[in-house]
Interface confidence: low
């Protein structure tokens, strides 16, 4: 008889999760020479150790420390790109602007991007049926705690001018409850980060409003300024043209700062 399993509100662990993580790790270390020293089996073991046989609503950042240690990576100053609610464009950007990095361009972010996982208390099994939902079940679940942990670390290690891409189509352009608003903003280090530059991405071609004047952006500016970090904001009215010019900066039509 199949043993009883806790039913959570969220979708279960991504199919072939261990194989996916291991394969991504191997691929990443092959492509990034500075990470060639990483032993992917050890990475998987550390990843697995963070959540296997643990109650999936009682995961802590401490659980992920062995993994974080193995995945230690630094981003050059001025090259960190944070994002909130606009992941696809941020990733399209760093795919072209290869010297800038989102969290998902780093090893740990790359391993976990778009995946779901959880285990069960006192068994070595992975739960492929359901996992805790952040709202309906609990916030201290394996996936949420992972992203909180690596996002905190990513922000803590940033230096120089940090950029953040924000979605100008949302009612809250800056959302204090997002990972960016609740974790990354508060973990930028004023002694290392001289400025945060927000890029507000416009959704509509006819939209010429200055979204840098949006009340939520002013709120972000206030939070950042109180932390003794300078704040700048730019409207990106034409994200399609923005990417086009990142691809072809030598095009005479693209002689503009981003």
């Amino acid at each position: 008889l199949p043993r009883w399993r806790q039913q959570w509100s969220g979708s279960g662990t991504t199919s072939r999760f261990p194989e996916t993580v291991l394969a991504r790790c191997v691929k990443y270390t092959e492509v990034h020479p500075e990470m060639r020293h990483v032993d992917c089996q050890s990475v998987w073991d550390a990843f697995k150790g963070a959540f296997i046989s643990k109650y999936p609503c009682n995961i802590t950042e401490e659980d992920y420390q062995p993994l974080v240690k193995l995945g230690t990576q630094t981003v050059p100053c001025n090259k960190t790109l944070l994002w909130s609610r606009i992941k696809d464009l941020a990733h399209q950007f760093t795919q072209v602007q290869r010297d800038m990095f989102t969290l998902e361009d780093m090893l740990l972010g790359y391993l976990a991007d778009d995946l779901t996982w959880c285990g069960e208390f006192n068994t070595f099994e992975i739960n492929y049926q359901s996992c805790p939902d952040w709202r309906k079940d609990c916030s201290n679940n394996p996936v949420s705690v992972f992203w909180k942990t690596v996002s905190r670390r990513f922000a803590e290690t940033a230096c120089g001018v940090v950029h953040v891409m924000l979605n100008g189509s949302r009612s809250k352009i800056f959302d204090k409850n997002s990972t960016f608003g609740s974790v990354e903003v508060h973990n930028l280090q004023p002694e290392k980060v001289q400025a945060l530059e927000a890029w507000v991405i416009h959704g509509g071609r006819e939209d010429s409003r200055d979204l840098c004047q949006d009340p939520t952006i002013k709120e972000l500016e206030s939070i950042i300024s109180k932390r003794n970090i300078r704040f700048f904001c730019k409207n990106i009215y034409r994200p399609d043209k923005f990417l086009q010019c990142v691809k072809n900066p030598e095009d005479s039509s693209c002689l503009s700062g981003i």
Partner: antibody, heavy 123, light 111 residues
Framework: EVQLLESGGGLVQPGGSLRLSCAAS????????MSWVRQAPGKGLEWVSD????????HYVDSVKGQFTISRDNSKNTLYLQMNSLRAEDTAVYYC????????????????WGQGTLVTVSS | QSVLTQPPSASGTPGQRVTISCSGS????????VSWYQQLPGTAPKLLIY???QRPSGVPDRFSGSKSGTSASLAISGLRSEDEADYYC???????????FGGGTKLTVLG
């Protein structure tokens, strides 16, 4: 090939008005911010005004605020500068210049220029 | 009085290296990109340098730009007689919400 062709300059008395035009070709006009830059005889360049790709945002140098109006007609690929209450100090060659794709970016500068049209304000 | 400050003149002999400075403040050069333009006598300005140090295609690599803090400079190496022109620096000024130019530097190639 990008081309910008200014017209509408000439001799005008103090207090008079002129409307400059800049006909653009060789690129998608409504993708770009545009500017007017002037140069008084024997002097340096002075940025006058700029307008965003869809006309939604305009800026002016303090000395012409309330006096000049920048506009554009994207259906005609044309940029305009309406100049009222002209003074002797407005005498200059006026250049139309193509700015950046992202109007308020910190890199708003000018990759292409027209040959300029001379405005002379004198009685 | 220009917002950005340039020396009114500079000179050099063919083959020499000449540097033109451009000084501003935190609201323009300090926070924003600098570009440089060359204006030959009787012609419209031409973009030489953008984004502080980038050259548009077609501009010889004898021209280079750099920036430090609130100052920028244009260097011309291997000076040629055809480089004799007026040179202008330009930036965006965040507090003025507009572009600003330097007063221009007249470069004379001697001999």
């Amino acid at each position: 090939e990008v081309q910008l062709l200014e017209s509408g300059g000439g001799l005008v008395q103090p207090g008079g008005s002129l409307r400059l035009s800049c006909a653009a070709s060789g690129f998608t006009f409504d993708d770009y911010g545009m500017s007017w830059v002037r140069q008084a005889p024997g002097k340096g360049l002075e940025w006058v005004s700029d307008i965003s790709w869809n006309g939604g945002k305009t800026h002016y140098v303090d000395s012409v605020k309330g006096q000049f109006t920048i506009s554009r007609d994207n259906s005609k690929n044309t940029l305009y500068l309406q100049m009222n209450s002209l003074r002797a100090e407005d005498t200059a060659v006026y250049y139309c210049a193509r700015g950046s794709l992202f109007h308020d970016s910190s890199g708003f500068y000018f990759g292409h220029w027209g040959q300029g049209t001379l405005v002379t304000v004198s009685s | 009085q220009s917002v950005l400050t340039q020396p009114p003149s500079a000179s050099g002999t063919p083959g020499q290296r000449v540097t033109i400075s451009c000084s501003g403040s935190s609201s323009n050069i300090g926070d924003n990109y600098v570009s440089w333009y060359q204006q030959l006598p009787g012609t419209a300005p031409k973009l030489l340098i953008y984004r502080d140090s980038q050259r548009p295609s077609g501009v010889p690599d004898r021209f280079s730009g750099s920036k430090s803090g609130t100052s920028a400079s244009l260097a011309i190496s291997g000076l040629r007689s055809e480089d004799e022109a007026d040179y202008y620096c330009q930036s965006y000024d965040s507090s003025l919400s507009g572009s600003v130019f330097g007063g221009g530097t007249k470069l004379t190639v001697l001999g």
